[in-house]
Amino acid sequence: WELTILHTNDVHSRLEQTSEDSSKCVNASRCMGGVARLFTKVQQIRRAEPNVLLLDAGDQYQGTIWFTVYKGAEVAHFMNALRYDAMALGNHEFDNGVEGLIEPLLKEAKFPILSANIKAKGPLASQISGLYLPYKVLPVGDEVVGIVGYTSKETPFLSNPGTNLVFEDEITALQPEVDKLKTLNVNKIIALGHSGFETDKLIAQKVRGVDVVVGGHSNTFLYTGNPPSKEVPAGKYPFIVTSDDGRKVPVVQAYAFGKYLGYLKIEFDERGNVISSHGNPILLNSSIPEDPSIKADINKWRIKLDNYSTQELGKTIVYLDGSSQSCRFRECNMGNLICDAMINNNLRHADEMFWNHVSMCILNGGGIRSPIDERNNGTITWENLAAVLPFGGTFDLVQLKGSTLKKAFEHSVHRYGQSTGEFLQVGGIHVVYDLSRKPGDRVVKLDVLCTKCRVPSYDPLKMDEIYKVILPNFLANGGDGFQMIKDELLRHDSGDQDINVVSTYISKMKVIYPAVEGRIKFS
């Protein structure tokens, strides 16, 4: 018996087609992805093959103005239109709190939403009961398939799930659900979830009875053969893990941003064992036409976005200096504003010992592309912010050793004075440079804001300590020459859309007046 699994993950509000790098589509003839194109390919496969499941492994939320404006209603609407069979909850589904998940998505989705390792308690338990499930058994052709969901246990540090949801260890939570399905004669089981490729592989290895793992969170690109675009494969598709009980378990993921549709064919024997698995992600490029009815619906929903981008978010009473003459050479108040917004967006009261789990921000000055003039009545709009942050990136959470941070700050000024983008703007950091010293030895003081303290204060950076830092995904991926970050990071979790972080902060503050305050000094 053969099953076709079509899968997406980490779509992050890319409802419209995008450029090859998943940013805003500029040249339509070379654009990719988007729900209208995805629908065309899904329907083509559904018509051609008998047993097809369309699954999403989480993080539909967050990433473009679509989410900022529609807050998840767009996810439910277009996933319903594509007739997804199931979705696992990702960490970003909690970005607007539990209410922001329940109302627009859980109550409106016409497909099961899954997570076995999220347990509700207190007053939320009855409110959320039945709105998401640990698993769902689906009839597929003449057989039944169990889909078991899971979500990153790090979600409380990455999003805003509140205090009434407990995120258990994925493997511990999945095993009893799989065991239950087995006793009920469900012998074909897919684990669908959002914890990253390393956890996906562990689930394949450790959870007895899981036949296939469909994952997300790490934006992992797997491919067998010559890859069709710029993404470099992290391994073959499917990636085969040998389980502790000796089975070959295929593990798949489909990069991110709706650029690819994962396509996996699994052959099962009559006892539900996987005999074979093969496939590849399908690049959703312009050779696949956009479905006209879905495209028309997108265009209808699009109107509200255009109106939103010119509305006032808040006011500035000072000039927001985002000029390259400032931000690539010295502390600039636009950099301070953005870093303050980044930290504010990551406020999660961890426990009594920590005032917050993260206090530091770094931001490449070259990523700040425009100033905002306060003389236009002080008005700040989304449109203004899109000029400052035009690349459609995210502000991510990483864990780094102090020694890596020190290297990063040396890199920040290794060729100082040439107006290059790697000069770092900061938050929760005090750095002093001596440019008379040779490159690689110019950081003379580096103090960082404590997190394990009731009154935050600056302490010298410790080389062997592990620190959490918020930074642009561009830097996490080694951009602007920050190879040491990419090579030495200990953990990387993708965060919220950059413009959204800053716009939310400005809306919250209402009036802003960021200063240059001595975060970066030269001796």
Epitope: R46, P50, N51, R83, K110, F111, P112, S129, G130, L133, P134, Y135, K136, V137, L138, P139, V140, G141, D142, E143, V144, K180, L181, L184, N185, V186
Partner: antibody, heavy 118, light 107 residues
Framework: QVQMKQSAAEVRKPGASVKVSCKAS????????MDWVRQAPGQGLEWMGD????????IYNQKFKGRVTMTIDTSRSTAYMELRSLRSDDTAVYYC???????????WGQGTTVTVSS | DIQMTQSPSFLSASVGDRVTITCKAS??????LSWYQQKPGKAPKTLIY???RLIDGVPSRFSGSGSGTDFTLTISSLQYEDMATYYC?????????FGGGTKLEIK
Amino acid sequence: QVQMKQSAAEVRKPGASVKVSCKASGYTFTDSNMDWVRQAPGQGLEWMGDINPNNGGTIYNQKFKGRVTMTIDTSRSTAYMELRSLRSDDTAVYYCARTNWDYAMDYWGQGTTVTVSS
Amino acid sequence: DIQMTQSPSFLSASVGDRVTITCKASQDINSQLSWYQQKPGKAPKTLIYRANRLIDGVPSRFSGSGSGTDFTLTISSLQYEDMATYYCLQYDVFPRTFGGGTKLEIK
């Protein structure tokens, strides 16, 4: 509005077969599975099976396996349930019911009475 | 197969009363439970699915609750037209199984 119109009552002798039809309207036929449920006189409801109109895939209650066949004709938006080797205890009202996105039955046909008597 | 035990099997109540019918599954059914109303000589009518979601057009006096193995159908203020037999169904796994029914009579 969603409607399911079933075929008329049938009388059969033991050992014979019966085929009940269910014509759906008011929605896209291939978007929802169809379940079949029966109810013997004065008794409760009993689930018989499920069919997917897209591919004809069926899940049967083991109790009826080998005796029941569920089929579809998408051009007519009609589902069929055939029960063979009829016995007197197969006398019942047979219902078709559409399932919603959650695979829960939501709209029901009016029922078809099948009487098995020698 | 999962067994569904409904209670009571017979219930008599007055117009305006609050009525509750319970359904117990032999094991956790993951909120995959629906409730049906059947009047004599008629086809069943779906009231609730996913334990607590009301089907469009069903009066708001009907509500469902519960999770795991224990579920309840509540009629907040009984009306004459509610006289019927009520069934629960688990659709968590195959085969789907119904409760034995609760016959509700108006005093």
